[in-house]
Amino acid sequence: DAEFRHDSGYEVHHQKLVFFAEDVGSNKGAIIGLMVGGVVIA
């Protein structure tokens, strides 16, 4: 039997991704981060 129409079954949650670079001093280089929903994850 063919399947009846349904969505994918997976909910997509949209969140804002914010890339940032921060200068932390003359000899330490820069931190590059990725913030997802307000939490730095990388």
Epitope: D1, A2, E3, F4, R5, H6, D7, G9, E11
Partner: antibody
């Protein structure tokens, strides 16, 4: 509020074509994910699914009746129409329409039903 | 077609007592998207069907929490923890995973 209302001829003769109309209010069939299905229930018996139509005009039919069924929509009138050709006394039933909405906004189930319209096929 | 078999067909219950209705499908109704589309409807005398449970165990809004659904694969159950007089009617399971959509024969709940 959400309502669906079925209308039909009440009585018709064998071999005639049955035209049923479901008029929708409180929601629009042009809304993404929205669909309307038709069901029937012979007197004293159980429920049978007939057909379904979606907002994007995708349609699905019960294979056992497919050759006799046509479902269509008129978005401007907010109506869904089901026709059944070559009717027979066994098509005597109460006919219901019901809505179903895909996606996270809907339950993806028949959440609102019409009151039903009774159709008798007799010579 | 997927055949849906309900038991019992008649269910006399004393108010305040629990009730359970079984629905078995002739084949798996697990959809390719990972969901199982098994629904429960109640048709009260002289009324249209009304949605109780969708996707096996989700209660529709406004449905009392005494109603619960469970199951997987081919075996599903509707439970009423404490039956009330207003619960009388015919209960139908419906699978909407495969075409054609198919109902169980119905279970008539009556008050003893």
């Amino acid at each position: 509020q959400v309502t669906l209302k079925e209308s039909g001829p009440g009585l018709l003769k064998p071999t005639q074509t049955l035209t049923l109309t479901c008029t929708l209010s409180g929601f629009s069939l042009s809304t993404s994910g929205m669909g309307v299905g038709w069901f029937r229930q012979p007197p004293g018996k159980g429920l049978e699914w007939l057909a379904h139509i979606w907002w994007d005009d995708d349609k699905s039919y019960n294979p056992s009746l497919k050759s006799r069924l046509t479902i269509s929509k008129d978005t401007s009138k907010n109506q869904v129409v089901l026709t059944i050709t070559n009717v027979d006394p066994v098509d005597t039933a109460t006919y219901y329409c019901a809505r179903r909405q895909l996606g996270t906004r809907g339950t993806d189930a028949m959440d609102y039903w019409g009151q039903g319209t009774t159709v008798t096929v007799s010579s | 077609d997927v055949v849906m078999t309900q038991t019992p067909l008649s269910l006399p219950v004393t108010p305040g007592q629990p009730a359970s209705i079984s629905c078995r499908s002739s084949q798996s109704i697990l959809h390719s998207n990972g969901n199982t589309y098994l629904e429960w409807y109640l048709q009260k005398p002289g009324q249209s069907p009304q949605l109780l449970i969708y996707k096996v165990s989700n209660r529709f809004s406004g449905v009392p929490d005494r109603f619960s659904g469970s199951g997987s694969g081919t075996d599903f159950t509707l439970k009423i923890s404490r039956v009330e007089a207003e619960d009388v009617g015919v209960y139908y399971c419906l699978q909407t995973t495969r075409v054609p959509l198919t109902f169980g024969q119905g279970t008539k709940l009556e008050i003893k």
